[in-house]
């Protein structure tokens, strides 16, 4: 039994990191493999993550984590029963990818206007929570040509839109992810998507 | 009520050996990492070792590493200091205290927060 | 290894006067967690050490509120408000961010 492709880890920012990476061959992840980790510090112990299959080869673990520091550092040891089959580390803040937004709501309710609200993914105290910004997707069902993304680089966790930059008579869905510059993360998965039914008043035209 | 009652100590020969205990109470032992420290006559402090909660991650002093051994039975709540290769240099008195809760992703420190009474060990011919 | 230095080394106080000690560590004792890893202890005679001030800043359980703890990075100060008899001893500094942890000298506080 042998590792094909070495773990790699991403981390949330705040309780869980994942780690995946393939096998030379099918394996029952979690019956033949434990991935043991250790924070560096004083006095820590060793924990140990149970994968999950991801694909016939794949295994992937999730990390539980009571928090992160930029200064955190862990040593990553993958077993097969008594067998080491790899050893190494993983600094989380240098593989951040955040959690996706939640909440997802568009109100279409005030005149012209579509206002999207999404929830930040963190809490006020982690370190991630003022420095998220966004990327809002919104297409129509309809035409797939109908695509198009808003950056939302400012911190409020929304964006409005006139509502006759769309097509009206016609449904849209949209969907929000995260990212951090501050610690150069991936982008998060994308929200959930909501969909509406995008209609506003033409204006009259005068002649 | 919080308890770390030390035993073992008494004196010795230079190059003999002892077995220090330290046997606890009032708290969940196995989640605590414990270390010992130890004070000459008329000196300030001086670590000795450290051990995890599990048993996995285990510390020495510089002064102490290769003659001393930490260990420590989670199903008697008692941590052991074995001395071995005593020297006079050794003679002090010897306190187990607790340690931080190890058993989290990140031990949680709220200092040495007890300590027992002390075992005292002279090494002397 | 991190070496702890304390000044003053002998402290008398009057009754009901305020008090400080101060210690300095040759490298920084701050984790990346916010987190000093310095104590205090007080060492009465004839007595085992006893915790007073743990990470930097936070009383332990029972002390009195006439001790504190303040500093960061790698100088520290232990106050007593107002001093009272009881508080005669040995105050050591330690940290506990790095093995081995590693005390300072001692500050031995005598009444007036």
């Known amino acids: 039994m042998k590792v094909l492709q070495e773990p790699t880890c991403v981390s949330d920012y705040m309780s869980i990191s994942t780690c995946e990476w393939k096998m030379n061959g099918p394996t029952n992840c979690s019956t033949e493999l434990r991935l043991l980790y250790q924070l560096v510090f004083l006095l820590s112990e060793a924990h140990t993550c149970i994968p999950e299959n991801n694909g016939g080869a794949g295994c992937v673990c999730h990390l539980l984590m009571d928090d992160v520091v930029s200064a955190d550092n862990y040593t990553l040891d993958l077993w097969a029963g008594q067998q080491l089959l790899w050893k190494g580390s993983f600094k989380p803040s240098e593989h951040v990818k955040p959690r996706a937004p939640g909440n997802l709501t568009v109100h279409t309710n005030v005149s012209d206007t579509l206002l999207l609200t999404w929830s930040n993914p963190y809490p006020p105290d982690n370190y991630l929570y003022n420095h998220l910004t966004y990327a809002v997707n919104i297409w129509s069902e309809n035409d797939p040509a109908d695509f198009r993304i808003y950056n939302v680089t400012y911190l409020e966790p929304s964006l409005r839109i006139a509502a006759s930059t769309l097509k009206s008579g016609i449904s849209y869905r949209a969907r929000v992810r995260a990212w951090a510059q501050c610690y150069n993360t991936t982008w998060s998965e994308w929200s959930p998507s909501t969909k509406w039914h995008n209609s506003y008043r033409e204006p009259f035209e005068q002649h | 009520e919080v308890q770390l009652v030390e035993s073992g100590g008494g004196l010795v020969q230079p190059g003999g050996s002892l077995r220090l205990s330290c046997a606890v109470s009032?708290?969940?032992?196995?989640?605590?990492?414990m270390s010992w420290v130890r004070q000459a006559p008329g000196k300030g402090l001086e670590w000795v070792s450290s051990i995890t909660g599990g048993g996995g991650g285990i510390y020495y002093a510089d002064s102490v590493k290769g003659r001393f051994t930490i260990s420590r039975d989670n199903s008697k709540n008692t941590v052991y200091l074995q001395m071995n290769s005593l020297r006079a240099e050794d003679t002090a008195v010897y306190y187990c205290?607790?340690?931080?809760?190890?058993?989290?992703?990140?031990?949680?420190?709220?200092?040495?927060?007890?300590w027992g009474q002390g075992t005292t060990v002279t090494v002397s011919s | 290894d991190i070496v702890m230095t304390q000044s003053p080394l002998s402290l008398p106080v009057t009754p009901g006067e305020p008090a400080s000690i101060s210690c300095r560590s040759s490298?920084?004792?701050?984790?990346?967690?916010?987190?000093?890893?310095l104590d205090w202890y007080l060492q009465k005679s004839g007595q085992s050490p006893q915790l007073l001030i743990y990470l930097g800043t936070n009383v332990a359980a029972g002390v009195p509120d006439r001790f504190s703890g303040s500093g960061s990075g790698t100088d520290f100060t232990l106050k007593i408000s107002r001093v009272e008899a009881e508080d005669v001893g040995f105050y050591y500094c330690m940290q506990s961010l790095r093995t081995p942890y590693t005390f300072g000298q001692g500050t031995k506080l005598e009444i007036k």
């Open positions: 009032g708290f969940t032992f196995s989640s605590y990492a």
């Open positions: 490298r920084s004792v701050l984790y990346g967690n916010g987190y000093n890893y």
């Open positions: 205290a607790k340690d931080r809760i190890s058993i989290t992703i990140r031990p949680r420190y709220f200092g040495l927060d007890f």
